[in-house]
C-alpha cells in the first residue's frame, strides 16, 4: 500500500551523491527501514531493542546510512543518469505495536549539475 509522496524534502544532493531521507515518527522504538528503487531493495536498516534497552542496528543490504531519532538517511554516491527513478522508504514498525507498514517516496531527477564526474 503506497501512502503517497513524502511531504518533506527527500533528496539532498552533495558532492556528486545524494542523501535520501526516510523519516519515521518519534515514538517508534523498533523498526525496519528499506530503501526501494522501483521495486528493488537497495538498502535496509533494522533497529531493535534487547534486554536492558540495548539497541541493535542491523543491515542485510548495506548502504552507507545514518540513523537519527526520527529518520534514516541512505547515501548513494557517483550519481549518473541510471539513478533517476522512483525511490521509496518502506517502513515496518514493530514497536510500539501493532505491526504497521508505510510506503512513501518520490522521483529522483538527475540533472547534469548533480552528476559526479562531469566532463568539462
Amino acid at each position: 500500500e503506497i501512502n503517497g509522496s513524502a511531504n518533506y524534502e527527500m533528496f539532498i544532493f552533495h558532492n556528486g551523491g545524494v542523501q535520501i531521507l526516510c523519516k519515521y515518527p518519534d515514538i517508534v522504538q523498533q523498526f525496519k527501514m528499506q530503501l526501494l528503487k522501483g521495486g528493488q531493495i537497495l538498502c535496509d536498516l533494522t533497529k531493535t531493542k534487547g534486554s536492558g534497552n540495548t539497541v541493535s542496528i542491523k543491515s542485510l543490504k548495506f548502504c552507507h546510512s545514518q540513523l537519527s531519532n526520527n529518520s534514516v538517511s541512505f547515501f548513494l554516491y557517483n550519481l549518473d543518469h541510471s539513478h533517476a527513478n522512483y525511490y521509496f522508504c518502506n517502513l515496518s514498525i514493530f514497536d510500539p505495536p501493532p505491526f504497521k507498514v508505510t510506503l512513501t517516496g518520490g522521483y529522483l531527477h538527475i540533472y547534469e549539475s548533480q552528476l559526479c564526474c562531469q566532463l568539462k
Epitope: 515514538i27 510500539p96 504497521k100
Partner: antibody, heavy 120, light 106 residues
Framework: QVQLVESGGGLVKPGGSLRLSCAAS????????MNWFRQAPGKGLEWVSY????????YYTDSVKGRFTISRDSAKNSLYLQMNSLRAEDTAVYYC?????????????WGQGTTVTVSS | DIQMTQSPSTLSASVGDRVTITCRAS??????LAWYQQKPGKAPNLLIY???SLESGVPSRFSGSGSGTEFTLTISSLQPDDFATYYC????????FGQGTKVEIK
C-alpha cells in the same frame, strides 16, 4: 471458514485464576499477530494483550501486567490467556482477535467472546 | 496514552438518513484508525481500517475520512441492519477505543 472460538471463561473468586483459550481455524494461524480484548458489562472495548507472529513479542495493558500471560501454540492453532490474581474489575467478556496481515491495521476477525466473572 | 473521544454518544436516526459520527484523538495518529460496528451480545465487526479503507464485504454505504486528530464515519443511507454501536480505535501506539456511539431508531 475463517474462525476464532474462545473458551475457558467462568465464575471465579477474587484472587483466583482462569485460562482462556482461542482456537483458530481456516487460516494460517502462525502468520498472524493476535490480541485479547475485553468489554466490561455495559462498557466499551479495551485492549488487553498482544503477541506477534514469529518471535512472539508480547505486550500488555498496564492494569494486567504481572497478572496475565499471553501465549500461543502454532502446532495447535491456539492462543491463550492465563489470568492470575483476578480482581472484580477484570469481569468482562474477553475476545481474541486477529490483526490484519498486511500491516495496515484493524482487527479483521474476532471470536464470539467468553465471559469472565470475578465475584465472591 | 492516546485518548479517543467520539461524538455523539447517542444518535437517533431513521432509515434512509445520512449519518456522521466523529472521532477525535488526543494527539496526531496519522491515518492509523479503524471503525467497528457492534451489536448487542456480539463481537465487533471491522468496517474501516487506515481511516478510509473499506474492509472486504462491508457495504459501500460506509465510508471513513480524516487524518491527524479528526476522523469521521459516514453511513450514506442508513439501513435497518445498521442500528448498532460504533467504535473508533486508534492503533498508532498500542490500541485505544472511543467510548462508542449508539445509533438508535428515531
Amino acid at each position: 471458514q475463517v474462525q476464532l472460538v474462545e473458551s475457558g471463561g467462568g465464575l471465579v473468586k477474587p484472587g483466583g485464576s482462569l485460562r482462556l483459550s482461542c482456537a483458530a481455524s481456516g487460516f494460517t494461524f502462525s502468520d498472524y499477530y493476535m490480541n485479547w480484548f475485553r468489554q466490561a458489562p455495559g462498557k466499551g472495548l479495551e485492549w488487553v494483550s498482544y503477541i506477534s507472529s514469529g518471535d512472539g513479542t508480547i505486550y500488555y495493558t498496564d492494569s494486567v501486567k504481572g497478572r496475565f500471560t499471553i501465549s500461543r501454540d502454532s502446532a495447535k492453532n491456539s492462543l491463550y490467556l492465563q489470568m492470575n490474581s483476578l480482581r472484580a474489575e477484570d469481569t468482562a467478556v474477553y475476545y481474541c482477535a486477529r490483526d490484519r496481515l498486511t500491516g495496515t491495521g484493524g482487527m479483521d476477525v474476532w471470536g464470539q467472546g467468553t465471559t469472565v466473572t470475578v465475584s465472591s | 496514552d492516546i485518548q479517543m473521544t467520539q461524538s455523539p454518544s447517542t444518535l437517533s436516526a431513521s432509515v434512509g438518513d445520512r449519518v456522521t459520527i466523529t472521532c477525535r484523538a488526543s494527539q496526531s495518529i496519522s491515518s492509523w484508525l479503524a471503525w467497528y460496528q457492534q451489536k448487542p451480545g456480539k463481537a465487533p465487526n471491522l468496517l474501516i481500517y487506515k481511516a478510509s479503507s473499506l474492509e472486504s464485504g462491508v457495504p459501500s454505504r460506509f465510508s471513513g475520512s480524516g487524518s491527524g486528530t479528526e476522523f469521521t464515519l459516514t453511513i450514506s443511507s442508513l439501513q435497518p441492519d445498521d442500528f448498532a454501536t460504533y467504535y473508533c480505535q486508534q492503533y498508532y501506539s498500542y490500541w485505544t477505543f472511543g467510548q462508542g456511539t449508539k445509533v438508535e431508531i428515531k
